[in-house]
C-alpha cells in the first residue's frame, strides 16, 4: 500500500513539475525590466525564450520573436536546448510511469518489469528536474553578469537586443516557476526510484524441509522462487489476475484536446 | 469615431473645489487609460495624470498629486476629475484624452474651462 | 522631469513650402526592448484641442496626411511639412511618453503669409 501511494504521489509531484517546466518555457517573463533604480519609465520590458516584450502604460503590448538562430548568444541557446531536454525526458519519464503504476494492470505485466520501469521514470524526472534547474540557473547568472554591463547601445545577453543606458533586466517569474518545477519533477523522480525498490520483488527461501523416505534419506532443499515469474512448478502460489480479455479493436486510444496545441 | 464629451465652463470661487466629467462613447471604456491634461490660457501642456477605468488604479504627476483626484464610473463610461483648494493658478482648460499606441493621447475631448475668480 | 526644447518658437512659411521643425529631449526616449522611440507630435489649431499626428517618433496616426514626417531617434526629433497648406496653421507640440510624468515641448506656432 505504502509502495503504490509513494509511486502515485511521485507520478503526481512529477506530472505538476512538468507542467511546471513546460509553463516556464514558454513564459515571457524570464528576464523582467528592473524598476528598482528607475521606477519613471511609461514602458516596461520583459523577455522570454522565444520573444521579448513591451507593455506600454497605455495598455498597449507588443511581442517580437526572435527570428535568428544563428545571432542568438550561445548561452540563450543552450537554455533553450536545457528546457526542451527536460521537457522530452520528463514527458518520455510521465508516459513510462504510467504503464509502471502498481494501480493500473496492463495485460499480464510482471511486477520485475514494472519495477523496472518505475526505476526508469524515476531517473528521466530526475535528469529532467536537473535540467529545468540548470537551464534557469545559467540564464540567472547569464542576468547578474548583465545586470551591471547594461550601458548604451551594447549587446546583451537577451536576444541580442540593443539596450540603453536605463534598461536593465532583472529575474522574471518564469525563473522561480522553473526553479519550483524542476525541484518538483526531481522530487518525484526520487520516489518514483524509492517506490521502485518496494515493487522489486524481494527472492523468497523457503527454509529446508527434511523428507524422510523409507530406506533414503533424502533432503529436498527448494531453491528460492521469484513469486511473480509464474515459471516452474510453483505456479499455485501466485495469484493469476485476468485483466479481461479484450480485442484490438477495443483498445482505442482517443486523442484528447492536448493532441493539436 | 471615438467620442470624449466634457463637462461645461465653471466659474468657482478661490478655495472651493470643482469635478470635470469626461463621458466616453463608441469604444471599450475599461480598455483604455483616460489622461488628463492642463492647458493655461496662451500656455503649453501640462499632464496631470491617468487613470485605468478598468481596475480604478492612478498615476499622477507629482506637482498635482494633492490638487487633483481622479475617478471613473465603469456604468456610466465616465471618467472624473477633481480639483481642490483652487486658486487663480488653477484656471485653465482641463482636457481628458484616451491612451493611445507609443503612451500617446490618441484621442481627445473639447475641453473644460475652469475660471478661478473671486 | 524631462524637458523638451522645441524649436523655432514660430516660422512663417508660404503655401507650398517645405517646413522642418525640431524637438530635442534632456534624456533618450529610445527604449532598448523594441528599439521605438517614445516621442509624439501633436498639431492644436486655435480654439481646438490637440490633435495626434505621430507617435514612436515615426509612426503616422491614420487619416493624418501624408505630408507630416516625424523622424529623428534618442534625443533628437524632427516634424517636416512637405508642402505646408493654409490649413496647417496651428501650434505643434512633442510630447515624452517615456518617462514619468509625460512633459510636453513649449510648442513651435506655424503661420501662413
Known amino acids: 500500500m505504502a509502495v503504490t501511494a509513494c509511486q502515485g504521489l511521485g507520478f503526481v509531484v512529477s506530472l505538476i513539475g512538468i507542467a511546471g517546466i513546460i509553463a516556464a518555457t514558454c513564459m515571457d517573463q524570464w528576464s523582467t525590466q528592473d524598476l528598482y533604480n528607475n521606477p519613471v519609465t511609461a514602458v516596461f520590458n520583459y523577455q522570454g525564450l522565444w520573444r521579448s516584450c513591451v507593455r506600454e502604460s497605455s495598455g498597449f503590448t507588443e511581442c517580437r520573436g526572435y527570428f535568428t538562430l544563428l545571432g542568438l548568444p550561445a548561452m540563450l541557446q543552450a537554455v533553450r536546448a536545457l528546457m526542451i531536454v527536460g521537457i522530452v525526458l520528463g514527458a518520455i519519464g510521465l508516459l513510462v510511469s504510467i504503464f509502471a503504476l502498481k494501480c493500473i494492470r496492463i495485460g499480464s505485466m510482471e511486477d520485475s518489469a514494472k519495477a523496472n520501469m518505475t526505476l526508469t521514470s524515476g531517473i528521466m524526472f530526475i535528469v529532467s528536474g536537473l535540467c529545468a534547474i540548470a537551464g534557469v540557473s545559467v540564464f540567472a547568472n547569464m542576468l547578474v553578469t548583465n545586470f551591471w554591463m547594461s550601458t548604451a547601445n551594447m549587446y546583451t545577453g537577451m536576444g541580442g537586443m540593443v539596450q540603453t543606458v536605463q534598461t536593465r533586466y532583472t529575474f522574471g517569474a518564469a525563473l522561480f516557476v522553473g526553479w519550483v518545477a524542476g525541484g518538483l519533477t526531481l522530487i518525484g523522480g526520487v520516489m518514483m526510484c524509492i517506490a521502485c525498490r518496494g515493487l522489486a520483488p524481494e527472492e523468497t527461501n523457503y527454509k529446508a524441509v527434511s523428507y524422510h523416505a523409507s530406506g533414503h534419506s533424502v533432503a529436498y532443499k527448494p531453491g528460492g522462487f521469484k513469486a511473480s515469474t509464474g515459471f516452474g512448478s510453483n505456479t499455485k502460489n501466485k495469484k493469476i489476475y485476468d485483466g479481461g480479455a479484450r480485442t484490438e479493436d477495443e483498445v482505442q486510444s482517443y486523442p484528447s484536446k492536448h493532441d493539436y496545441v | 469615431e471615438v467620442q470624449l464629451q466634457q463637462s461645461g465652463a465653471e466659474l468657482v470661487r478661490p478655495g472651493t473645489s470643482v469635478k470635470v466629467s469626461c463621458k466616453a462613447s463608441?469604444?471599450?471604456?475599461?480598455?483604455?487609460?483616460i489622461e488628463w491634461v492642463k492647458q493655461r490660457p496662451g500656455q503649453g501642456l501640462e499632464w496631470i495624470g491617468m487613470?485605468?477605468?478598468?481596475?480604478?488604479?492612478?498615476h499622477y504627476n507629482e506637482k498635482f498629486k494633492v490638487k487633483a483626484t481622479l475617478t471613473a464610473d465603469k456604468s456610466s463610461s465616465t471618467a472624473y476629475m477633481q480639483l481642490s483648494s483652487l486658486t487663480s493658478d488653477d484656471s485653465a482648460v482641463y482636457f481628458c484624452?484616451?491612451?493611445?499606441?507609443?503612451?500617446?493621447?490618441?484621442?481627445w475631448g473639447q475641453g473644460t474651462l475652469v475660471t478661478v475668480s473671486a | 522631469d524631462i524637458l523638451l526644447t522645441q524649436s523655432p518658437l514660430s516660422l512663417t512659411v508660404t503655401a507650398g513650402e517645405k517646413v522642418t521643425m525640431s524637438c530635442k529631449s534632456s534624456?533618450?526616449?529610445?527604449?532598448?526592448?523594441?528599439?521605438?522611440?517614445?516621442l509624439t507630435w501633436y498639431q492644436q489649431k486655435p480654439g481646438q484641442p490637440p490633435k495626434l499626428l505621430t507617435y514612436?517618433?515615426?509612426t503616422r496616426e491614420s487619416g493624418v496626411p501624408v505630408r507630416f514626417t516625424g523622424s529623428g531617434s534618442g534625443t533628437d526629433f524632427t516634424l517636416t511639412i512637405s508642402s505646408v497648406q493654409a490649413e496647417d496653421l496651428a501650434v505643434y507640440y512633442c510630447?515624452?511618453?517615456?518617462?514619468?510624468?509625460?512633459?510636453f515641448g513649449g510648442g513651435t506656432k506655424l503661420e501662413i503669409k
Open positions: 484624452a484616451r491612451g493611445g499606441f507609443g503612451n500617446s493621447f490618441a484621442y
Open positions: 514612436w517618433a515615426s
Open positions: 510630447q515624452n511618453g517615456y518617462f514619468y510624468p509625460y512633459t
Open positions: 534624456q533618450s526616449l529610445l527604449n532598448g526592448g523594441n528599439l521605438k522611440n517614445y
Open positions: 463608441r469604444y471599450a471604456f475599461t480598455n483604455y487609460l
Open positions: 487613470i485605468n477605468p478598468g481596475s480604478g488604479g492612478t
